[in-house]
Amino acid sequence: DVERTTCPPEKEVHEIDESLIFYKKRELEACVDAALLAAQMDRVDAIPFTYEQLDVLKHKLDELYPQGYPESVIRHLGHLFLKMSPEDIRKWNVTSLETLKALLKVSKGHEMSAQVATLIDRVVVGRGQLDKDTVDTLTAFCPGCLCSLSPERLSSVPPSVIGAVRPQDLDTCGPRQLDVLYPKARLAFQNMSGSEYFVKIRPFLGGAPTEDVKALSQQNVSMDLATFMKLRREAVLPLTVAEVQKLLGPHVEGLKVEEQHSPVRDWILKQRQDDLDTLGLGLQGGIPNGYLILDLSVREALS
């Protein structure tokens, strides 16, 4: 912590300007009034403060706003945002797209994923839901950031907004997030024709249940291997060899390349070897011919 000293009269600060870069840490602490700093935050980012000096300015704001900064200050944090922790950001109420844009720009190129995730979360809370304008802003200024939101926050996305989401925005989404987004996407694209529907729904299929994957296998979609590999393991395991062959079409040959990776490996283990042999790909590890398969989970459920 910066030790408290009195401000020399000749160092008194009446406005935030370039002269402050020559102040030592303790002089900044003693001479800069926190309320003045807050009122003139828009000037701070134009001044080349050192990281040490920024620490002092942050300390000033923290003292003035222990419950969290007002958005009028947040809007103009600039590079001071790089000093914020997720815990700091959690106290904020952020509603403006301009605030979001400004801080996303500042965070670019810095390891700020936790801070950005928390910031986006605060925007969603502040605006009442993850609306189309927020999604548009994220896709423009922070591709992939959508996936930093928790499944709970993503549940506030109205299906009408899903159309604004691009495939690359979902690249870093995990299964739990896709579980939330998939039903919304299904609803959003339900009136589209088969081929158009598949193009739109494809990035969300990591959240699809078995019955939907089975339905796709009847529609000649020729799913690429990359999409197939992102399907939920639970959705793939019940598929028959014939269904997988129909689903992948000409891409079925790619199963050989992925035979040691989940979900392909787990699916192979559940198939009869003679069924796998019909694919002519040399896939090994299926259930040998003549073996009886007992599903113990069913028996336990009945007892």
Epitope: D42, E71, S72, R75, T95, S96, L97, E98, T99, K101, A102, V125, G126, R127, G128, Q129, D131, K132, D133, T134, D136, T137, S156, P158
Partner: antibody
Framework: QEQLVESGGGLVQPGASLTLTCTAS????????MCWVRQAPGKGLEGIAC????????TYYASWAKGRFTISKASSTTVTLQMTSLTAADTATYFC????????????WGPGTLVTVSS | DVVMTQTPSPVSAAVGGTVTIKCQAS??????LAWYQQKPGQPPRLLIY???NLESGVPSRFKGSGSGTEFTLTISDLECDDAATYYC????????????FGGGTEVVVR
Amino acid sequence: QEQLVESGGGLVQPGASLTLTCTASGIDFSRYYMCWVRQAPGKGLEGIACIYIGGSGSTYYASWAKGRFTISKASSTTVTLQMTSLTAADTATYFCARGTNLNYIFRLWGPGTLVTVSS
Amino acid sequence: DVVMTQTPSPVSAAVGGTVTIKCQASQSINNGLAWYQQKPGQPPRLLIYSASNLESGVPSRFKGSGSGTEFTLTISDLECDDAATYYCQCIWDGNSYVNAFGGGTEVVVR
């Protein structure tokens, strides 16, 4: 005293184009949302477009206004609204309003300028 | 776009009475709501912002409440000067909210 004044209204023929100007005085024009809102005779308020005067210069449009209306910052004290392919349905009083630097809270409005589209 | 629906219109009450105007948003907007008063031949005047904050210079007879999708403007101790049309508006920035005004509610003071 902070003030907004709209100009450029008047009588125009259907299909014509028109540019309205909002001039600010006594105002720090930077870092605010400036918006255009219209009101047809005896009807309610209808938002048209907003521009963020500041770093981003972002523009936002009502879905019905995209393509036919263009908002822009013309100078440090003026914002314009270009309107094309005007029809009788565009007859209204056009207001210029200033939001905050964060949102569309309109504390300051101009008196409005009347646009009449008629042959 | 967000759609703001106002009810009822018109509403009538006697001097000294109370009127309540409701505004409903088509999606959750948290506290992102403003209320305006407009008299014939004049631009609107801001009364309430962020759902419940009274604008400087506005009498405390005007009270805003609500959050999410349901909002209310209550005017108590009605005066003749309160006769006007009142509009709600979602204040968030972005394309979806540029045209986020309610249809207006006319208040008639008897």
